[in-house]
């Protein structure tokens, strides 16, 4: 997805909650065997954080060889370290698989800040803490990268979650989502809990700290609070929702709704920042700067290339505002919004000069691709990716960081006229996205 | 070790273009932002311009409609383009790297001394 | 864009001496103050980042203070390897802007 702090229309009436219950998750709609309930074996099974990207451990090949994968719904390759590199303490060894096949075919992804490459081969895979199941799943094995592995964030490789459309090097590379839905009786969805530290971690605190789960094949009622409300997949490529409206503490941004969503609105776990077109990122930079202004803050910071600090324990959150992005729904003329705070979009980070501090970044950034919810919007929300019924769905997190005055929020129905002018539709090209 | 080092071509004849490279070792370019800083002979220091991390870039205002900053991250190089040089712009020219956590220019090069005469 | 004036622009001063630099910002620059050391030979170095904070490496006879426009840089003990050019810059507002500098000299 892409690397940076990846490593990027019609405003419609966004009014007061409507007096009807619009249908959503919680109704009483049958449900498919093992959609629901728990998932014991599943919960906790990501580490990391939202800077370097949450991993969960796979093991390929026969004998199985573990690594940490980097679960990304911005691509749709399953790729791994396969060749010695200074940031991988292990790598894929293929010719220690009895099992590994070559595909006799190479791929080539670059990105806009680095590349990998490799040889594309199939091979057995299994989740330790996911379902009870092997899959014979592509891999490509990565032999040559630039700037891709990253210093110390302990995965080797990536599990791209999107679809086929955007696999690399075209869309008849099946990926590894729709190989595990079509050899086992695993239900087409997943869904993901991350959850930021609020704190910066140190390496062995992110070793031993427990990033949030990844639930294949269901839904975990442990892992939200509330009602989960559902926004349609505008395409399957990557996970393409359409925002109808922005809220910067209430007040509405006013911009035409085409613009949030130009050129398109992805939800993406390999991205650190909430990444908004250069126009939104503009009016949304402005607005949180009006409502923080209590505070002087340096350019470099609203650039996302210079820290604030302030002494241990004492940083303002009550003067930065909370933002609200509101999701087309279900129904005709029906959204729903979910809200976050500044304890998401205020990454912490390590003050290297001194620990007395507690130091931010500011993590909305500007993109030329489109909105990209990452990592600073997950970690307030559980994110239920139902490829089934073509639909992602947001609840509170029941781990998001907040304070006593305020909490993460996911509300609705609203009445919300002509959404469907909000979506951009994009010449078609092949991009793809990871962690900046 | 972190390093820049400034290669210009010390001479430019009036209205002619100035190019200076600005290469680096031991950070990357994708991490750390490079800015280019000028001193004319016996005068202070004037900010030039800036290349974020993510390659977009921030210029002086005055003189902004003559200068362009562009990399490349493979080769460690920051370029610092200038156009219609006049005597004026007769300087020591620094690449110097900006630190977010500092919010400073951390480490500069030891600068390349550019010339504008006929 | 913000101006940074130091309004001496020479001093002189004996080693052993403490010797104080000041800067004044045209507005609120909220300590995104720092400042900076270029030798004889044009090396330039940083001192002193976010009004009073050192950088690695900078001999603890260095402090910075100040807050709002005034700011000021403090050598407390002057030594010969001090002999230099001392410029402060504002990191708050883009365009960044330097002082004109205040140089230092051994009476």
């Known amino acids: 997805t892409q690397h940076g702090i990846r490593l990027p229309l019609r405003s419609g009436l966004g009014g007061a909650p409507l007096g009807l219950r619009l249908p959503r998750e919680t109704d009483e709609e049958p449900e498919e065997p093992g959609r629901r309930g728990s998932f014991v074996e599943m919960v906790d099974n990501l580490r990391g954080k939202s800077g370097q990207g949450y991993y969960v451990e796979m093991t390929v090949g026969s004998p199985p060889q573990t690594l940490n994968i980097l679960v990304d719904t911005g691509s749709s390759n399953f790729a791994v370290g396969a060749a010695p590199h200074p940031f991988l303490h292990r790598y894929y060894q293929r010719q220690l698989s009895s099992t590994y096949r070559d595909l006799r075919k190479g791929v080539y992804v670059p990105y806009t800040q680095g590349k990998w490459e490799g040889e594309l081969g199939t091979d057995l895979v299994s989740i330790p803490h996911g379902p009870n199941v092997t899959v014979r799943a592509n891999i490509a094995a990565i032999t040559e990268s630039d700037k891709f592995f990253i210093n110390g964030s302990n995965w080797e490789g990536i599990l791209g979650l999107a679809y086929a459309e955007i696999a690399r090097p075209d869309d008849s590379l099946e990926p590894f989502f729709d190989s595990l839905v079509k050899q086992t009786h695993v239900p087409n969805l997943f869904s993901l809990q991350l959850c930021g530290a609020g704190f910066p971690l140190n390496q062995s605190e992110v070793l031993a700290s427990v990033g949030g789960s990844m639930i294949i094949g269901g839904i975990d009622h442990s892992l939200y609070t509330g009602s989960l409300w559902y926004t349609p997949i505008r395409r399957e490529w990557y996970y393409e929702v359409i925002i109808v409206r922005v809220e910067i503490n209430g007040q509405d941004l006013k911009m035409d709704c085409k613009e949030y969503n130009y050129d398109k609105s992805i939800v993406d776990s390999g991205t650190t920042n909430l990444r908004l077109p250069k126009k939104v990122f503009e009016a949304a930079v402005k607005s949180i700067k009006a409502a923080s202004s209590t505070e002087k803050f340096p350019d470099g910071f609203w650039l996302g290339e210079q820290l604030v600090c302030w002494q241990a324990g004492t940083t303002p959150w009550n003067i930065f505002p909370v933002i609200s992005l509101y999701l087309m729904g279900e129904v005709t003329n029906q959204s729903f919004r979910i809200t976050i705070l500044p304890q998401q979009y205020l990454r912490p980070v390590e003050d290297v000069a001194t620990s007395q501090d507690d130091c931010y970044k500011f993590a909305i950034s500007q993109s030329s691709t489109g909105t990209v919810m990452g990592a600073v919007i997950m970690e307030g929300f559980y994110v239920v990716f139902d490829r089934a019924r073509k639909r992602i769905g947001f609840a509170v997190s029941a781990c998001h960081v907040h304070d006593e005055f305020r909490t993460a929020a996911v509300e609705g129905p609203f009445v919300t006229l002509d959404m469907e002018d909000c979506g951009y539709n994009i010449p078609q090209t092949d991009e793809s996205t990871l962690m900046t | 070790e972190v390093k820049l080092m400034e290669s210009g071509p010390g001479l430019v004849a009036p209205s002619q273009s100035l190019s200076i490279t600005c290469t680096v070792s031991?950070?990357?370019?994708?991490?750390?932002?490079i800015n280019w800083v000028r001193q004319p002979p016996g005068k202070g220091l004037e900010w030039l311009g800036v290349?974020?991390?993510?390659?977009?870039?921030n210029y002086n205002s005055a003189l902004k409609s003559r200068l362009s900053i562009s990399r490349d991250n493979s080769k460690s190089q920051v370029f610092l383009k200038m156009n219609s040089l006049q005597t004026d712009d007769t300087a020591r020219y620094y690449c110097?790297?900006?630190?977010?956590?500092?919010?400073?220019?951390?480490?500069w090069g030891q600068g390349t001394t550019v010339t504008v005469s006929s | 864009d913000i101006v940074m004036t130091q309004t001496t622009s020479s001093l002189s001063a004996s080693l052993g001496d403490r010797v104080t630099i000041s800067c004044r910002a045209s507005q609120d620059i909220s300590k995104y103050l720092n400042w900076y050391q270029q030798k004889p030979d044009g090396t330039v170095k940083l001192l002193i980042y976010y009004t009073s904070r050192l950088h690695s490496g900078v001999p603890s006879r260095f402090s910075g203070s100040g807050s709002g426009t005034d700011y000021s840089l403090t050598i407390s003990n002057l030594e010969q390897e001090d002999i230099a050019t001392y410029f402060c810059?504002?990191?708050?507002?883009?365009?960044?802007?330097f002082g004109g500098g205040t140089r230092l000299e051994i009476k």
């Open positions: 031991g950070f990357s370019l994708t991490s750390y932002p």
């Open positions: 290349i974020w991390t993510g390659g977009s870039t």
């Open positions: 110097a790297r900006w630190d977010g956590y500092f919010g400073a220019f951390d480490y």
């Open positions: 810059q504002q990191s708050l507002s883009l365009p960044y802007t």
